[in-house]
């Protein structure tokens, strides 16, 4: 058995359903996406040995599903997947990778062929711990590269300042596939949000530890860089689920109420 979870049940139905649903979010001139053709292109990877799938195997899939990303709306992330999805709000606020068509259809899904057979493996799929060229990692590598290349304007990045190995994973999709593919001439600046989990450990904040590494890397590449600790709009969203926690006390609101009284 592999280390990862097996192929998601009803993979094809979920994929096609998400694709059809997403088309409504696209501008009229981009709405002519053929979801069946996109599925067939994706399925190429499902016909290969589960440790022999390369990012390039998804080229046709990307070409068929690719669309423009609004300027200033890109939101990259590490170790904050659910928070990013909630905050982006189905493209309303931002458009992270999971909110572009080619990311949406695969978000939180798993897939692979059986090792010595043609059917899908519903028991387990390989992770990077099993083999590098596995279907899921190769997919997200290819998708991440495309997402970076198509991003423009102000680039936003949400990182987790409560992550034990550091807010900026030196070995991660953002470091290895997204930063190198940012198109400098299309980007005005990069804004980082270091979010801390409510009640979680304070591992790093802006200008500390691995964040110094990230800042140096981006500045060396010629990018304008800014960093915000616990970006307030996102912090307010986190506090929805922790309204009584001391970190969520609305000090300014309380002060305003007192003044009124």
């Amino acid at each position: 058995r592999w280390r990862g979870e097996g192929t998601s049940a009803h993979l094809r139905d979920i994929f096609l359903g998400r694709c059809a649903e997403y088309r409504a979010l696209l501008s009229p001139e981009q709405r002519n996406k053929n979801c069946t053709a996109i599925w067939e292109a994706f399925k190429v990877a499902l016909d290969k040995d589960p440790c022999s799938v390369l990012p390039s195997d998804y080229d046709l899939f990307i070409n068929l599903s690719r669309h423009s990303i609004p300027r200033d709306k890109s939101l990259f992330w590490e170790n904050s997947h659910l928070l990013v999805n909630s905050f982006a709000d189905n493209t309303r606020r931002f458009m992270p990778l999971s909110d572009v068509l080619y990311g949406r259809v695969a978000d939180f899904l798993s897939w692979c062929r059986q090792k010595n057979d043609s059917g899908l493996d519903y028991q387990s799929c390989p992770t990077s711990e099993d083999c590098e060229n596995n279907p899921v990692d190769s997919f997200w590598k290819r998708a991440s590269i495309q997402y970076s290349k198509d991003s423009s304007g102000v680039i936003h990045v949400m990182l987790n300042g409560s992550e034990p190995t550091g807010a900026y994973p030196i070995k991660g999709f953002f470091a290895d596939y997204e930063i190198p593919n940012l198109q400098k001439e299309k980007i005005t600046r990069i804004e980082i949000w270091v979010m801390h989990e409510i009640g979680g450990p304070n591992v790093e904040s802006c200008g500390e530890g691995s964040m110094k590494v990230l800042e140096k890397r981006l500045k060396d590449m010629g990018f304008q860089y800014s960093c915000i600790n616990d970006y307030r709009p996102v912090k307010l969203l986190q506090c929805v689920d922790h309204s009584t926690h001391p970190d969520c006390a609305l000090k300014s609101a309380a002060a305003a109420t007192q003044r009124k009284a």
Epitope: G161, G166, I170, P201, N202, E204, G209
Partner: antibody, heavy 117, light 109 residues
């Protein structure tokens, strides 16, 4: 230049508490993480725990119940406290600096601690 | 939590090339970097290689790091071995915490 220096008692009685101090210079404790690592005589290295730049801590699960790491950023000092010492805790204790919490770029000279009655 | 296994001791001739291995017990090094430290007798460790293959300033380019996927091992290669290379070498990686290999004692003949 970057320096870390451990200090503390060379001899501790069994069942007593060990208190060590790591005094750093050339960098800020709010910019770099500091770990404690120990090495019994003639043996390998064992990671004990870390105090992150944000002030939170994490510990080796085998030592967690008797270990505490804290700091005083104004004095550029990191402290280790470990209780219920046994003879197998005899080791050289090092503090080490990290820019990411996953590897060490600078080490202290170490302090040898013997647990014996 | 995985274990990192290193040979206890390795002997090599002056001027030759030696490869020190660090084998991971479960999983591979795909999602975790490996770092290497040198420790001379009675001294504190110093970083020789970090993030698989990067050399800190001041470390001779005779030292290099790599990952051998076929054997699921990290390798520290020392070219043109010198007498001052005689020391203990520790590999290190991480998962939920820092993990060290048991160390290899390198003897230069």
């Amino acid at each position: 230049q970057v320096q870390l220096k451990e200090s503390g008692p060379g001899l501790v009685q069994p069942s007593q508490t060990l208190s060590l101090t790591c005094t750093v210079s050339g960098f800020s404790l709010t910019s770099y993480h500091v770990s404690w690592v120990r090495q019994p005589p003639g043996k390998g290295l064992e990671w004990m725990g870390i105090i992150w730049t944000g002030g939170s801590t994490a510990y080796n699960s085998l030592l967690k119940s008797r270990l505490s790491i804290s700091r005083d950023t104004s004095k550029s000092q990191v402290f280790l406290k470990m209780n219920s010492l046994q003879t197998e805790d005899t080791a050289t204790y090092y503090c080490a600096r990290s820019i990411t919490p996953t590897f060490f770029d600078y080490w202290g000279q170490g302090v040898m601690v013997t647990v014996s009655s | 939590q995985f274990v990192l296994t290193q040979p206890n001791s390795v002997s090599t001739n002056l001027g030759s090339t030696v490869k020190l291995s660090c084998k991971r017990s479960t999983g591979n090094f795909g999602s975790n970097y490996v770092n290497w430290y040198q420790q001379h007798e009675g001294r504190s460790p110093t970083t020789m290689i970090y993030r698989d293959d990067k050399r800190p300033d001041g470390v001779p380019d005779r030292f290099s790091g790599s990952i051998d996927r076929s054997s699921n091992s990290a390798l520290l290669t020392i070219n043109n071995v010198q007498t001052e290379d005689e020391a203990d070498y520790f590999c290190q990686s991480y998962s939920s915490g820092i993990v060290f290999g048991g160390g290899t004692k390198l003897t230069v003949l």
